[in-house]
Interface confidence: low
């Protein structure tokens, strides 16, 4: 349309228009985590505030058991936060004796679940190793990028453990998407 | 909309449309940052380039004293990294002699402030313990997410030590945030 | 436009409206990299997988020889992490004997290149210096940012040492525009 | 269209300092580089150095740091660039030219004389 | 410092002839983003230089194709084909790969 003169007689577009405010969003807030089964060999899922506060879902974006919910197919920006805190890790003590030690380290993994498709697609992961040395360490895995979703995907947040996550502060932990 | 057929005399739309490139976008880069007084437990703003290098700001969204001033309603995502730097953190000379110590930090928080309510909100904190040992240490600190915002809020970056922050270049420090 | 009863009749809008999945859009993944050279005090760029896995360019937006090119001038979304592994650093062997000393570092760069502009600009920093002590380590650094870009501008991902980049899995490393 | 004006010539005395503009036309000033070259009487083209008018980045050739020091005022498309401690060495005429992937428009040339 | 070498320093010519410039540098100007930033100026005298050819071999606007640039690496040739009363002057080859950017001495076209 570069250059185009705009009138609503010769209007040249090649798919529906579309309100900008109509579109699916959803920002996620950290909640206490209440210990949980989750499968051998898989991180556990974190679950999240959905309206209180600074989070809220619209536009037939809904929160359910950990998973957000697409309602419409298109191109997603899909972001989160996740506040890690812990002590000492034991890696420490075992380098200052001298022997290296392969890191503890923290995870977090956004993940795509297709129910059509039998195995669970990790479209994000940001993966740290700590060898802290402090008596108590604390930082935070920042993760967004853009994802193709099918109207029916369901969207979650894992951690590598969910003990270490910072839980106090609707703003250190967060997780969203956007409909673009 | 989906599989609609579009032409003008049966658009059906919810809410009024508006051109993209209409929408009030800002992207703020570092500049050296003056002393300055800040409240007793409140950490300092930063101040930035609103118009020089890669820095803009458009479609009424203004920056002035520290602040972006949202000029309509709506669903913003915003952003921000500040790169640190510092010398050794006296955390890791304690450390060294033996003595754990609660770790030196670095934080960032993007603040909401609205004229209206007397506390400002935080809308996304990054914040993560500092035990370097090497002489000479540096970090970013990335923050991004969508937030609802109301025609007038104001947006701010506080940072927990503003001696930290390395203004040398454009591109490690940055806030930025639009309309969606 | 705000309150604006919706009509074509009376639709008063500034710009050429366009459907949203009609603009340019890209996210690229992780390959394995091939030894490159590279002009002295310049960092390698990377080169990306661009349409298998999670991988896509849609709407002009094309890939080729390690850049984005951009299709249409507008403000883009510009983002990439960088996951970097490495052995322990010198830095921290040194340290060990006591001798403080400038740490080793990971960077990653998101460049402009103009093709009527000689130099190219740098839009995005993530610099972390790493003064790491177990015997491995891991960890991303994460950028985006809104920019004004031109049609034919071309972005890159450039990375201080290319032989530290984790090519291993698709959500690891990744690097994606998308029109505002 | 694409247009540069310089100031008028110049006749200054040895030890001064001149200050020499040139005015944009025709395109996004702060967009575009403004360089800088000197040619002497019957001689060839020097590169003295750029100024990019939206951050005020400037890119020196050695031979002219401390000589020249390039500015511009983006509220009237100007560039300038100031010439301290002259000799009859700088008795040149002083040309601007915008650079895009090349020196495209050039303004018509400052011709200084430094005599006592 | 790159040196840009041109040859010949004076070159006459017949009206009609076809002409040749070489222009050399002292180490390649492939810049850092793969262009080669090579140009191609006359000046005529008690004007301002006019640019010809730029990043190697392009013609720039409203210049005759008469003109034609080519090279890489660190050889360069502008060429006229025939050679008309107005490209009489002096040709300036100049690089803007690296900093400082440099030009040519010159080769004065003038009439044989």
């Known amino acids: 349309l570069k250059g185009q003169e705009f009138a609503p007689s010769h209007q040249q577009v090649y798919a529906p228009l579309r309100a900008d405010g109509d579109k699916p969003r959803a920002h996620l807030t950290v909640v206490r985590q209440t210990p949980t089964q989750h499968f051998k060999n898989q991180f556990p899922a974190l679950h999240w505030e959905h309206e209180l506060g600074l989070a809220f879902t619209k536009n037939r974006m809904n929160y359910t058991n950990k998973f957000l919910l697409i309602p419409e197919s298109g191109d997603y920006f899909i972001y989160s936060q996740v506040t890690f805190r812990g002590m000492t890790s034991e890696c420490s003590e075992i380098r200052q004796a001298g022997r290296p030690n392969k890191p503890d380290s923290i995870t977090v993994v956004i993940t795509k679940v297709t129910d059509s498709y039998p195995e669970p697609t990790q479209l994000l992961m940001g993966t740290k190793s700590v060898c802290e040395v402090g008596s108590n360490w604390f930082q935070p895995i920042y993760l967004g990028a853009m994802f193709s979703l099918q109207e029916g995907d369901k969207l979650m947040v894992n951690v590598s453990d969910i003990s270490l996550v910072d839980y106090t502060k609707e703003d250190k932990t967060f997780f969203g998407a956007f409909l673009l | 909309l989906k599989g609609q057929e579009f032409a003008p005399s049966h658009q059906q739309v919810y809410a009024p449309l508006r051109a993209d490139g209409d929408k009030p976008r800002a992207h703020l880069t570092v500049v050296r940052q003056t002393p300055t007084q800040h409240f007793k437990n409140q950490f300092p703003a930063l101040h930035w380039e609103h118009e020089l290098g890669l820095a803009f700001t458009k479609n009424r969204m203004n920056y002035t004293n520290k602040f972006l001033l949202i000029p309509e309603s709506g669903d913003y995502f915003i952003y921000s990294q500040v790169t640190f730097r510092g010398m050794t953190s006296e955390c890791s000379e304690i450390r060294q002699a033996g003595r754990p110590n609660k770790p030196d930090s670095i934080t960032v928080v993007i603040t909401k402030v609205t004229d209206s309510y007397p506390e400002p909100t935080q809308l996304l904190m990054g914040t993560k313990s500092v035990c370097e040992v090497g002489s000479n240490w540096f970090q970013p600190i990335y923050l991004g997410a969508m937030f609802s915002l109301q025609e007038g809020d104001k947006l701010m970056v506080n940072v927990s030590d503003i001696s930290l922050v390395d203004y040398t270049k454009e591109d490690k420090t940055f806030f930025g945030a639009f309309l969606l | 436009l705000k309150g604006q009863e919706f009509a074509p009749s009376h639709q008063q809008v500034y710009a050429p409206l366009r459907a949203d999945g009609d603009k340019p859009r890209a996210h690229l993944t992780v390959v394995r990299q091939t030894p490159t050279q590279h002009f002295k005090n310049q960092f390698p760029a990377l080169h990306w997988e661009h349409e298998l896995g999670l991988a896509f360019t849609k709407n002009r937006m094309n890939y080729t020889n390690k850049f984005l090119l951009i299709p249409e001038s507008g403000d883009y979304f510009i983002y990439s992490q960088v996951t970097f592994r490495g052995m322990t650093s010198e830095c921290s062997e040194i340290r060990q004997a006591g001798r403080p000393n400038k740490p080793d570092s990971i960077t990653v760069v998101i460049t402009k290149v103009t093709d009527s502009y000689p130099e190219p600009t740098q839009l995005l920093m993530g610099t972390k210096s790493v003064c790491e002590v177990g015997s491995n380590w891991f960890q991303p650094i994460y950028l985006g940012a809104m920019f004004s870009l031109q049609e034919g501008d071309k972005l890159m991902v450039n990375v201080s040492d290319i032989s530290l980049v984790d090519y291993t899995k698709e959500d690891k490393t990744f690097f994606g525009a998308f029109l505002l | 269209q694409v247009q540069l004006q310089q100031s008028g010539p110049e006749l200054v005395k040895p030890g001064a300092s001149v200050k020499l503009s040139c005015k944009a036309s025709?395109?996004?000033?702060?967009?575009?580089?403004i360089n800088w070259v000197k040619q002497r009487p019957g001689q060839g083209l020097e590169w003295i150095g750029w100024?990019?008018?939206?951050?005020?980045?400037?890119n020196y050739n050695e031979k002219f740091k401390g000589k020249a020091t390039l500015t511009v005022d983006t509220s009237s498309s100007t560039a300038y660039m100031d010439l301290h401690s002259l000799t009859s060495e700088d008795s040149a005429v002083y040309f601007c030219?915008?650079?895009?992937?090349?020196?495209?428009?050039w303004g018509q040339g400052t011709t200084l004389t430094v005599s006592s | 410092d790159v040196v840009m070498t041109q040859t010949p320093l004076s070159l006459p010519v017949s009206l009609g002839d076809q002409a040749s410039i070489s222009c050399r540098s002292s180490q390649s100007i492939v810049h850092s983003n793969g262009n080669t930033y090579l140009e191609w100026y006359l000046q005529k005298p008690g004007q301002s230089p006019k640019l010809l050819i730029y990043?190697?071999?392009n013609r720039f606007s409203g210049v005759p194709d008469r003109f034609s640039g080519s090279g890489s690496g660190t050889d360069f040739t502008l060429k006229i084909s025939r050679v008309e009363a107005e490209d009489l002057g002096v040709y300036y080859c100049?690089?803007?790969?690296?900093?400082?950017?440099?030009f040519g001495g010159g080769t004065k076209l003038e009439i044989k």
């Open positions: 100049f690089q803007g790969s690296h900093v400082p950017y440099t």
């Open positions: 990043k190697v071999s």
């Open positions: 100024i990019y008018p939206r951050d005020g980045r400037t």
């Open positions: 025709g395109y996004t000033f702060t967009s575009i580089d």
């Open positions: 030219a915008r650079y895009t992937s090349s020196l495209d428009y």
